[in-house]
């Protein structure tokens, strides 16, 4: 960027020519004399360089008519190659009587206010000042294409030059290139390629895996319809004009396929009835995963081998498998699907549920009084194996004794062997309510429905047992 520099003073009021990249403010002689110095207001660094000129301020205007002012005709069309330099100008002769005159450059209807290389030269004599406004571009680009004009304002009137058309020619320039795609096998798809000059026309050749597809070129824009692929291919297009050829980026067209199975499965957590798993999906087959399937089967060789299937969304690669048996071994496989189909199942992994508290109470609880030994005998059936949810370590017996104004609850632990217990009578002439729960290392299961028996005063005899029926036995 040029910095503002002081300008030298010329001897006398009319320098032969003045060439600058900056916008000069020029004071020319008055009728009664002249100001002996040239005054400059250089543009600030980074400010627009416009060829604005202030023409002599005259104290009195003669009444005789003046010829209409117009820019001289100049070259109307300049054709050049990209990166070359160009210089063009407007010239006009302005009678010295006009005042406050400015020249500016415009391109395609917009004033050029950028850091353009605009130079204004002045050739004054007694009657008129010849002004030549030059515009130069050191290395033209496509963006410099367009219609350039000079404008001059004199006493609020605007004089416009003929346009100078700049046409920058170069290799074709892509405005639309083919895009990478994932396509279904043997299914047609389109690729688009568009390039512009100048010079026009631009012709397109398509290339697949380094071989030309079309014998004859197509005018840009070109749409290539590929009838279908069976394997991955790389496509590009060549754009040709009189200046040469440009090749687009090569794009890979992938064939959608079924995904690969997951590469990892992790057992995050296990409870008595659930297993939390996560997985790392395999390669998606160039098509987004839609959902995943968790397959679960009992690992026990004696099981019937039936497979439970749990479907879930592809994200977040996490699933809690529920409704499992406690203390059981399972084989788990994961597969995921995309629009093409399901992946193979991952290698089967092993996972176990933990021990839980039994899910049901002991069955057929029976209570009767053994008066001779002053004991209450209790019998029951252990919960079904499937619902023990672990290894039974024993039972917890709750017995509540109620008589007038007294209520007393006692808890007893009984070992796992056998299915009977004996408790001492605590209170006579009272009701004894018995409930039993099975116990595993996983915890205490639910208590059975209460069974009540009346304990008479000493001397009464009542051997009738009280019981809860087994399920299905009314």
């Amino acid at each position: 960027r040029e910095e503002a520099k002081p300008y030298p003073l010329f001897p006398g009021p009319f320098p032969g020519s003045l060439q600058t990249d900056h916008t000069p403010l020029l004071s020319l002689p008055h009728a009664s004399g002249y100001q002996p110095a040239l005054m400059f207001s250089p543009t600030q660094p980074g400010r627009p360089h416009t060829g604005n000129v202030a023409i002599p301020q005259v104290t009195s205007v003669e009444s005789k008519p003046l010829p209409p002012l117009a820019f001289k005709h100049t070259v109307g069309h300049i054709i050049l190659s990209e990166h070359k330099g160009v210089k063009f100008n407007c010239s006009i002769s302005v009678p010295n009587i006009y005042q406050d005159t400015t020249i500016s450059w415009w391109k395609d209807g917009k004033e050029l206010l950028g850091a353009h290389h605009a130079i204004t030269q002045f050739y004054p004599d007694d009657e008129v000042t010849a002004i030549i406004a030059s515009f130069s571009i050191t290395s033209v680009q496509r963006s410099d294409n367009g219609s350039y004009i000079c404008k001059m304002k004199i006493n609020n009137e605007e004089i416009v030059s003929d346009p100078i058309y700049i046409e920058v020619q170069g290799l074709p320039h892509f405005t639309k290139q083919p895009e990478s795609m994932n396509v279904t096998r043997n299914t047609a798809f389109n690729l688009t390629c568009q390039a512009v000059g100048p010079p026009e026309p631009v012709n397109i050749f398509w290339v697949q895996n380094s071989s030309r597809v079309n014998e004859q070129p197509e005018k840009s824009p070109s749409v290539l319809t590929v009838p279908g692929l069976t394997e991955m291919a790389v496509f590009s297009c060549e754009a040709h004009n009189d200046k040469g050829l440009t090749v687009s980026k090569g794009v890979q067209i992938n064939i959608k396929a079924i995904p690969s199975p997951p590469t990892e499965v992790s057992i995050r957590n296990s409870t008595a009835h659930s297993i939390l798993i996560s997985w790392v999906p395999g390669f998606d087959g160039y098509s987004p995963f839609r959902n995943c399937s968790i397959q679960v089967k009992e690992a026990d060789p004696l099981s019937n081998g039936s497979v439970m299937i749990f479907n879930t969304s592809a994200l977040p690669h996490l699933y809690q498998i529920k409704q499992l048996q406690a203390l059981a071994n399972y084989s788990i496989g994961v597969s995921c699907m995309n629009e093409i189909g399901w992946s193979a199942v991952s290698p089967w992994i092993l996972a176990s549920t933990t021990e839980g508290a039994p899910s049901v109470a002991p069955l057929n609880v029976t209570v009767f009084l053994n008066e001779s030994s002053d004991n209450v005998d209790i019998r029951w059936m252990k919960p079904p194996t499937k619902q023990q949810d672990g290894e039974l370590v024993g039972y917890r017996i709750s017995h509540v004794w109620q008589s007038a104004g007294i209520s007393k609850e006692l808890l007893e632990e009984v070992g796992q062997n056998g299915s009977r217990a004996r408790i001492s009578v605590q209170v006579h002439n009272a009701t004894c309510t018995v409930r039993i729960a099975a116990v595993t290392r996983g915890g205490v299961g639910p208590f059975s429905d209460p069974v009540k028996i009346f304990i008479p005063a000493h001397g009464w005899v009542d051997y009738a047992p009280s019981s809860t029926p087994a399920p299905g036995n009314a």
């Epitope: 957590n269 296990s270 790392v280 999906p281 991952s346 290698p347 992994i349 092993l350």
Partner: antibody
């Protein structure tokens, strides 16, 4: 093309340290577990350890403390940091992709299903 | 630690022979079948041949087959080809343990 390239091997004095690299191309470390295996001259294969896709590491009992596996997903590179090297650590060191891996997070162990892609190996010689 | 023992350690055979290599584990392999076989040629890395005890890896000729479950496994080459002279390793993992164990290897050489 899927490829593994080991580097960083060479001659090192006993007691020294060395960091091996395994550059991965054609697939992502963020979705595959990786392993290191070594082979002493004229001997069999010996597993060193594994790093899962999430970065969890598991090592052979003999390697714990001296050998550390790490990775940089942004560079798609796995590393093996070897400290306090001994003459018996002289071997060709291979990196390998784990075709499938099961992790037991609650119990802090994991099991390799198969090693389905191997690098060419890099020779480490520990000698004074 | 669990161990995998291969036998024989060396095997001399001719082109066209049927070759069998065994691999015995000191305890059950994970899921009874997570055992793989690898082939290695001098100066080259190992190459996966078989996984899940009997599944052929991609691109492996069908003359290779694997069998077995639990602790006893076998690799069979139905008709030995010149390209098959190499060292073969079995490998597997175990429940409760991260170690991936390799067998000691079986070198198949020309008779």
């Amino acid at each position: 093309e899927q490829q593994l390239v080991e580097s960083g091997g060479g001659l090192i004095q006993p007691g020294g340290s060395l960091r091996l690299s395994c550059a991965v191309s054609g697939f992502s470390l963020s979705s595959n577990a990786m392993s290191w295996v070594r082979q002493a001259p004229g001997k069999g294969l010996e597993w060193i350890g594994i790093i899962s896709s999430s970065g969890s590491t598991y090592s052979a009992s003999w390697a714990k403390g001296r050998f550390t596996i790490s990775k940089d997903n942004s560079k798609n590179t796995m590393y093996l940091q070897m400290n306090s090297l001994r003459a018996e650590d002289t071997a060709v060191y291979f990196c390998a992709r784990v075709g499938f891996f099961v992790g037991y997070g609650a119990y802090d162990y994991g099991i390799i299903h198969r090693l389905d892609l191997w690098g060419q190996g890099t020779l480490v010689t520990v000698s004074s | 630690d669990a161990q995998l023992t291969q036998s024989p350690s060396t095997l001399s055979a001719s082109v066209g022979d049927r070759v069998t290599i065994t691999c015995q584990s000191s305890k059950s392999i994970y899921n009874n079948n997570w055992l793989s076989w690898y082939q290695q040629k001098p100066g080259k890395p190992p190459k996966l041949l078989i996984y899940d005890a009997s599944d052929l890896a991609s691109g492996v000729p069908s003359r290779f087959s694997g069998s077995g479950s639990g602790t006893e496994f076998t690799l069979t080459i139905s008709s030995l080809q010149p390209d098959d002279f190499a060292t073969y390793y079995c490998a597997g993992g175990y429940s409760g343990d991260s170690d991936y164990a390799f067998g000691g290897g079986t070198k198949v050489e020309i008779k």
